[in-house]
Amino acid sequence: MSKGEELFTGVVPILVELDGDVNGHKFSVSGEGEGDATYGKLTLKFICTTGKLPVPWPTLVTTFSYGVQCFSRYPDHMKQHDFFKSAMPEGYVQERTIFFKDDGNYKTRAEVKFEGDTLVNRIELKGIDFKEDGNILGHKLEYNYNSHNVYIMADKQKNGIKVNFKIRHNIEDGSVQLADHYQQNTPIGDGPVLLPDNHYLSTQSALSKDPNEKRDHMVLLEFVTAAGITHGMDELYK
């Protein structure tokens, strides 16, 4: 067990703070919830503290919760590939470029680390080149979320990882908006981290609303499990 992994044996409180600017539309989001890495489970509620969110909530899911991939459930035989927990408590910087097909792009930078006993994800997001009447600024996405696989590989030069995946957002007219994600994670501290073999995270997300909440918000339930590396030969002969 890495030293960081020991911090994730029970329920951990999570705070998310995002400051965004998309085509000049500025906004802030606060999120709170908890994670349980034993089950790869995240429950979070997000509030737009600046009024109405200028972009659809589903376009921010990867920035919020795929940001705290330290809550992914890594099966016993894959624990030596869990970069995310090994970087804790000092944490990691997570940078992404998200290309929305035939539309604009988000660039995000986040610091994910423990502050006391709370896991904090502080994010800056800049969005440019979006069409004012496109699927994103035109709010044409359905309020739901598909399952995805998130592909992880080591980046030995930077003592971190590179991550690629493609999100499929459902559009109200029945078509799909693709969002290509290019992600890089580097540790904040200088302690040892686990550099993984190639594998993937399998994610399932459910979006809902709080019937008593008057502010613009999103409620998120997510399950994430690591997969893609089989048991070693020594396991087979036990």
């Epitope: 409180p13 999570i14 705070l15 709170e32 919830g33 429950t43 503290t49 006993d117």
Partner: nanobody
């Protein structure tokens, strides 16, 4: 689903007492600081009292110091507000809220909030 449900409000005479309760569900209560806020007609929503997750640190607005006591029972996922020596100016809707943040005092910044209970002092 996260829920915070306040109860115990009502009509009380000047100098009387009330005990408000806020029962929570859907989240891990004992990792959250809890706060009570109130909103009088035509006024802003102001913080009344706040209590740390373990219950050892409390904060009170000057207007209620020495009269109100905030407490919590982590085994019952409940926070209380004991209100004594009530005055007409305590008339308001009282809301409870939960947070992981150590520094915020504005009700609008709380992600988890209740629907409120009316307190009227005649």
């Amino acid at each position: 689903q996260v829920q915070l449900v306040e109860s115990g409000g009502g009509l009380v005479q000047h100098g009387g007492s009330l005990r408000l309760s806020c029962v929570t569900s859907g989240f891990t209560f004992d990792i959250h600081d809890m706060g009570w806020f109130r909103q009088a007609p035509g006024k802003e929503r102001d913080i009344v009292a706040r209590i740390s997750k373990s219950g050892d640190i409390t904060y009170y607005a000057d207007s209620v110091k020495g009269r109100f006591i905030i407490s919590r029972d982590n085994t019952k996922n409940t926070v209380y507000l004991q209100m004594n020596s009530l005055k007409p100016e305590d008339t308001a809707v009282y809301y409870c809220a939960a947070t992981l943040r150590a520094t915020i005092t504005s009700f609008d910044e709380y992600v988890y909030r209740g629907q409120g209970t009316q307190v009227t002092v005649s």
